[in-house]
Interface confidence: low
């Protein structure tokens, strides 16, 4: 890609558009992205389902997940279907469900610790949610030598879930949010999206 | 609109099994779970637990494991709570809730238990 | 499991006063949710994630709060926000409940 495909441009994945532009009815937590998204007003309800289709994925694959842990999963799904800004992240995928996928989008340290700090009461049986499931069902269940722990047993550090959860779709960032040099997962959108300042400040030197 | 119906009040003597249903409409039953909370007379909200609508996978608190069943019906969109060997502790007005958020709820169904 | 405790248990407030009520947590949570119950009805979702309004609900509620400290204020009592008020957490497995605030108008 370019650097001006860096900026403002939507990964060849499995519900993602084409091209970014305004969606003026995105739902609940993804309604930051409205003003220039890559995801669809269907795509951003559908992800805020326990039992969404995009993926039939569960998160409650180890009883429930608490709502304060999972609306930060929403946000993550929020920012992987709608953001237009996380170009100089794209990769090759090579999987037959998608082209492409993010790898190291530098993370805001504090969208990574309230992750975690959310999460770590919740139960999970997998470090990496990518692979090794039991689908045989249809949907994700833990395979019988996954046991169901504690996110803080499987994720002792909230660099190792936000790190590893995806297979390193992230990393985490030593700057904060509104340093114009991480991705920030929550931001108010009355303030312009402040990821736009970000993707600029990391495609002009991944380009020159 | 989204609306959770409950089945009518309930008088069952000590020992004998209630059932109580909660309908769904206005929404895609399996998109969302169930909570069901229980409210005795004169006090407050207590959480028994939640069904997952989607695999049927009952989860329970401590007080509310062994003679409480939470099950699904799902074509009806409907859930259940059944009540074994009622006691008269069991005596209270039970409640469901759409998961989550608890966004909604059901009206209530009033179990008495007397003999 | 975090116990909520909430105060006062009752308390009344005449129409146009300010009124506010507290819910305490016994360990940290990321939010607070209220809900509003008149006698003989089902709760309401009212405030969710400590300050958010519900639907319908009249912008003289507010919600507020961090930590193991939250508070919900009425700027201006109205006769039809006479109800219990509980606080709710679901920051930790199991969701528990506070014990209510009963709001009386005078």
């Known amino acids: 890609r370019d650097r001006t495909d860096l900026l403002n441009v939507c990964m060849d994945a499995k519900h993602h558009k084409t091209k970014p532009g305004p969606e003026d009815k995105l739902h609940d937590q993804c309604s930051p992205w409205k003003r220039n998204a890559c995801c669809s007003v269907n795509t951003s309800q559908e992800l805020h389902k326990d039992n969404s289709r995009l993926y039939n994925f569960n998160w409650d694959h180890c009883g429930e997940m608490t709502p304060a842990c999972k609306r930060h999963f929403i946000q993550d799904a929020c920012l992987y279907e709608c953001s237009p800004n996380l170009g100089p992240w794209i990769q090759q995928a090579g999987q037959s469900w998608r082209k492409e996928r993010f790898l190291d989008v530098p993370l805001c340290k504090e969208d990574c610790q309230e992750w975690w700090e959310a999460c770590r009461t919740s139960f999970t049986c997998k470090r990496d949610w990518h692979k090794g499931w039991d689908w045989t069902s249809g949907i994700n269940k833990c395979p019988d030598t996954a046991p169901c722990r504690t996110f803080q047993y499987y994720f002792p550090t909230p660099a190792s879930l936000c790190e590893g959860l995806w297979s390193h779709s992230y990393k985490v960032s030593n700057y904060s949010r509104g340093s114009g040099q991480c991705i920030q997962m929550w931001f108010d959108s009355t303030q312009g999206n402040p990821n736009e300042e970000v993707v600029k400040f990391y495609a002009s030197f991944m380009t020159s | 609109q989204i609306q959770l119906v409950q089945s009518g009040p309930e008088l069952k003597k000590p020992g004998e099994t209630v059932k109580i249903s909660c309908k769904a409409s206005?929404?895609?039953?399996?998109?969302?779970?169930m909570n069901w909370v229980k409210q005795a007379p004169g006090k407050g909200l207590k959480w028994m637990g939640w069904?997952?609508?989607?695999?049927?996978?009952?989860t329970y608190t401590d007080d509310f494991k062994g003679r409480f069943a939470f099950s699904l019906e799902t074509s009806a969109s409907t859930a259940y709570l059944q009540i074994n060997n009622l006691k008269n502790e069991d005596m209270a007005t039970y409640f469901c809730?759409?998961?989550?958020?608890?966004?909604?709820w059901g009206q209530g169904t009033s179990v008495t238990v007397s003999s | 499991q975090i116990v909520l405790t909430q105060s006062p248990a009752i308390m009344s407030a005449s129409p146009g006063e300010k009124v506010t009520m507290t819910c305490s947590a016994s360990?940290?949570?990321?939010?607070m949710h209220w809900y509003q119950q008149k006698s003989g009805t089902s709760p309401k979702r009212w405030i969710y994630?400590?300050?958010k309004l519900a639907s319908g609900v009249p912008a003289r509620f507010s919600g507020s709060g961090s930590g193991t400290s939250y508070s919900l204020t009425i700027s201006s009592m109205e006769a039809e926000d006479a109800a219990t008020y509980y606080c709710?957490?679901?920051?930790?497995?199991?969701?528990?409940f506070g014990s209510g605030t009963k709001l009386e108008i005078k």
């Open positions: 809730a759409r998961k989550g958020a608890m966004d909604y």
């Open positions: 709710q957490q679901w920051s930790s497995n199991p969701p528990t």
């Open positions: 206005g929404y895609t039953f399996t998109n969302y779970g």
């Open positions: 069904i997952n609508t989607y695999t049927g996978e009952p």
């Open positions: 994630d400590t300050s």
């Open positions: 360990s940290s949570v990321s939010y």
